[in-house]
């Protein structure tokens, strides 16, 4: 007999699932309506193709990025798509709430839903750190919880720092990274003893996390210049990003190579340090003046980010109960600040330039953003991770980890759990 | 020669909808480089930016008038249509559509500077019962 | 918002005088200033773009400097067509661009 949801999570998980769900129905029966104005048809499919590469993104790319694990592959990608799910639905409520609640309705436009993919993309990067550690209802909690700290955060940098929409979103890479390092670090981390094969990859999984990290690599581009107006300014950060991206490709796979005693290529350092490039330039990558800077970039992240999976693994295992193919955690989080690090350098050279004497000024605000995004993760993280520990959600217990079994039906199998 | 002709009511009441159409020639709505914004100017007040749209459709707006705005563009006709929604007494002003141009400088980083290069004649609106 | 300041928000000046107007920008915004002069019961037209970059067709005095959160334009020698209200615009953020509120050059 397969295995079943304890019975307390049979009840609490649909209940606690579609009572939201009905909450967000009247949220948007109350509070939003279309946008009216006459799109022009032409802008209107190039806008919603953007917000289509984000969806393949988050569904596909990140669903099956995360799906190399033995026995949690179909938890993965399906956990994804609904956390994706609702992320969206709650992340719009909330942009337009916080944007432009005084008039008392929220416009949703092509644009808002885009917003809204990004922002529950945050989920879906942090994710990985917990996932096989916890329950959908469990996951429902981390989703709202993410989505309003992330936008909250968006909303006091927009008007402290005076930031647009792309700068103040090129801030999801370091947020959710540790938004979900530190839910990992408060959630129960000892594997007990014979179930240490559930978090080691098998070669079908990872072939379809390679294929996440395929869809991630070709629709990058997409997501760097997604919130950028200007088509010129849109066109140089796919430009960029492009040639990031492809640079981080052959440097991943060369690393790889170098940092193995026979030259042999790691899967998980490859599905990670393949996305390197994109990540470094995110938050500069309309500002790039040209494609050799992109690329050094690219190069730069590609060797931290193997260099990374190489050594930190064992780290983020010991002190978080990181399993080793979770590796988007600690990437995202070097490769986060590596993009922060590399805007404020670029501006700072800017400055010289220019010799205009506010150096000091554009880096402490920069600074000021940074921080202000990793304490507001870190703090929303813990909070979330102490909510998760709750005895209220059932959370799988330590020896049902990583385990599909838990949650699914698999009518061939003859002995459940 | 480029040219913006902004036309629309000349009187509008409290509360209606205000409808504006700028009318361009001389350069499309198309052109990467190029944009369409609305500025208006109340009597013997400072210039208020409104509203723009660029060449791919993406829109952006003053955030005080926000909820109130709606641009939209129709390139086959080379228009640009500004709504704005429960008008008020306040609101009585020149409004003017200009073209804003996109000039790109790269350094250090790339630079894009915008400008407002060419301007319509405006169109005065009152706003009375 | 980014908040403009222009100062004088008025002045008198004769022909052939140097007249400088400032604008105060309330954060960084790099070189993202233009400039504009509006005479009475006329469109704007723009003068200089890039906080110094002089717009094809404009006489060579006028000029513009400055970067961060202080500019200038600067009239190197006043004409008689040159009195009107000018006014600075940010471009920093693409696209929530802000006016200053007018500087007002009247003849003494």
């Known amino acids: 007999m397969s295995s079943k949801y304890p019975r307390s999570v049979r009840r609490c998980l649909p209940l606690w699932a579609l009572t939201l769900e009905a909450a967000l129905i009247l949220l948007f029966y109350f509070f939003t309506h279309y946008d009216a104005s006459l799109e022009d048809q032409k802008g209107l499919v190039a806008s919603y193709q953007v917000g289509q590469d984000l969806t393949v993104m988050a569904a596909i790319g990140l669903g099956f990025l995360t799906s190399s694990f033995r026995r949690h592959s179909w938890s993965s990608v399906a956990f994804n798509l609904f956390m994706l799910a609702l992320g969206v639905q709650w992340a719009i409520l909330l942009d337009g709430f916080l944007s432009q609640f005084p008039s008392g309705k929220v416009v949703i436009t092509l644009f808002s839903i885009r917003l809204a993919t990004m922002s529950a993309l945050s989920v879906l990067i942090s994710v990985d750190a917990v996932l096989g550690k916890v329950n959908l209802a469990q996951l429902v909690v981390m989703v709202l919880v993410e989505v309003t700290a992330l936008g909250n955060l968006r909303m006091v940098i927009s008007n402290i720092f005076n930031t647009d929409y792309h700068m103040n979103m090129m801030h999801i890479y370091v947020f959710a990274a540790y938004f979900g390092l530190s839910v990992a670090w408060c959630l129960p981390k000892p594997l007990p003893e014979g179930t240490e094969d559930k978090d080691q990859t098998a070669t079908i999984p990872s072939l379809s996390a390679m294929l996440g990290a395929l869809f991630l690599w070709m629709f990058w581009p997409s997501f760097n210049s997604a919130l950028l107006r200007s088509p010129i300014e849109r066109k140089n950060a796919v430009f960029n990003t492009y040639y990031a991206v492809a640079v981080s490709v052959v440097t991943a796979i060369s690393g790889s190579s170098l940092a193995h005693p026979q030259g042999k290529i790691s899967k998980t350092y490859v599905h990670s340090a393949v996305l390197a490039g994109g990540v470094a330039v995110g938050t500069s990558c309309h500002l790039i003046p040209s494609p050799w800077l992109a690329m050094v970039l690219g190069l730069v992240a590609g060797l931290i980010s193997v260099g990374g999976a190489k050594y930190l693994p064992g780290c983020c295992n010991r002190v978080l109960g990181i399993p080793h193919s979770s590796i988007m955690g600690y990437n995202f989080s070097l490769l986060g600040l590596l993009g922060e690090i590399i805007y404020i350098v670029l501006l700072v050279l800017d400055t010289v330039g220019a010799g205009n004497g506010m150096i000091g000024f554009q880096v402490l605000l920069s600074i000021g953003e940074l921080s202000l995004a990793i304490v507001i993760a870190l703090m929303s993280g813990l909070l979330t991770g102490l909510l998760l520990n709750l005895k209220i959600w059932k959370a799988p217990h330590e020896a049902k980890y990583f385990d599909d079994q838990v949650f699914w039906k698999f009518p061939h199998l003859a002995v459940g759990f | 020669q480029v040219t913006l002709k902004e036309s629309g009511p000349v009187l509008v009441k409290p509360t209606e909808t205000l409808t504006l159409t700028c009318t361009v020639s001389?350069?499309?709505?198309?052109?990467?480089?190029?944009?369409v914004s609305w500025i208006r100017q109340p009597p013997g007040k400072a210039l208020e930016w409104l509203a723009h749209i660029f060449s791919n459709d993406e829109k952006s707006y003053s955030t005080s008038l926000k909820s109130r705005l709606t641009i939209s563009k129709d390139t086959s006709k080379s228009q640009v249509v500004l709504t704005m929604t429960n008008m008020d007494p306040v609101d009585t002003a020149t409004y003017y559509c200009a073209r804003m141009r996109l000039t790109m400088v790269r350094g250090v980083i790339t630079y894009y500077y915008y400008s407002m290069d060419v301007w319509g004649q405006g169109t005065t609106v009152t706003v009375s019962s | 918002d980014i908040q403009m300041t222009q100062s004088p928000s008025s002045l008198s000046a004769s022909v052939g005088d140097r007249v400088t107007i400032t604008c105060r920008a309330s954060q960084s915004i790099s070189t993202y200033l233009n400039w504009y002069q509006q005479k009475p019961g006329k469109a704007p037209k723009l003068l200089i773009y890039?906080?110094?970059t002089l717009q094809s067709g404009v006489p060579s005095r006028f000029s513009g400097s400055g970067s961060g959160t202080h500019f200038t334009l600067t009239i190197s020698s006043l004409q008689r067509e040159d009195f009107a209200t000018y006014y600075c615009?940010?471009?920093?953020?693409?696209?929530?661009?802000?006016f200053g509120q007018g500087t007002k050059v009247e003849i003494k």
């Open positions: 001389g350069f499309s709505l198309s052109n990467a480089r190029m944009g």
């Open positions: 615009q940010q471009t920093y953020r693409t696209p929530t661009w802000t």
């Open positions: 890039a906080a110094s």
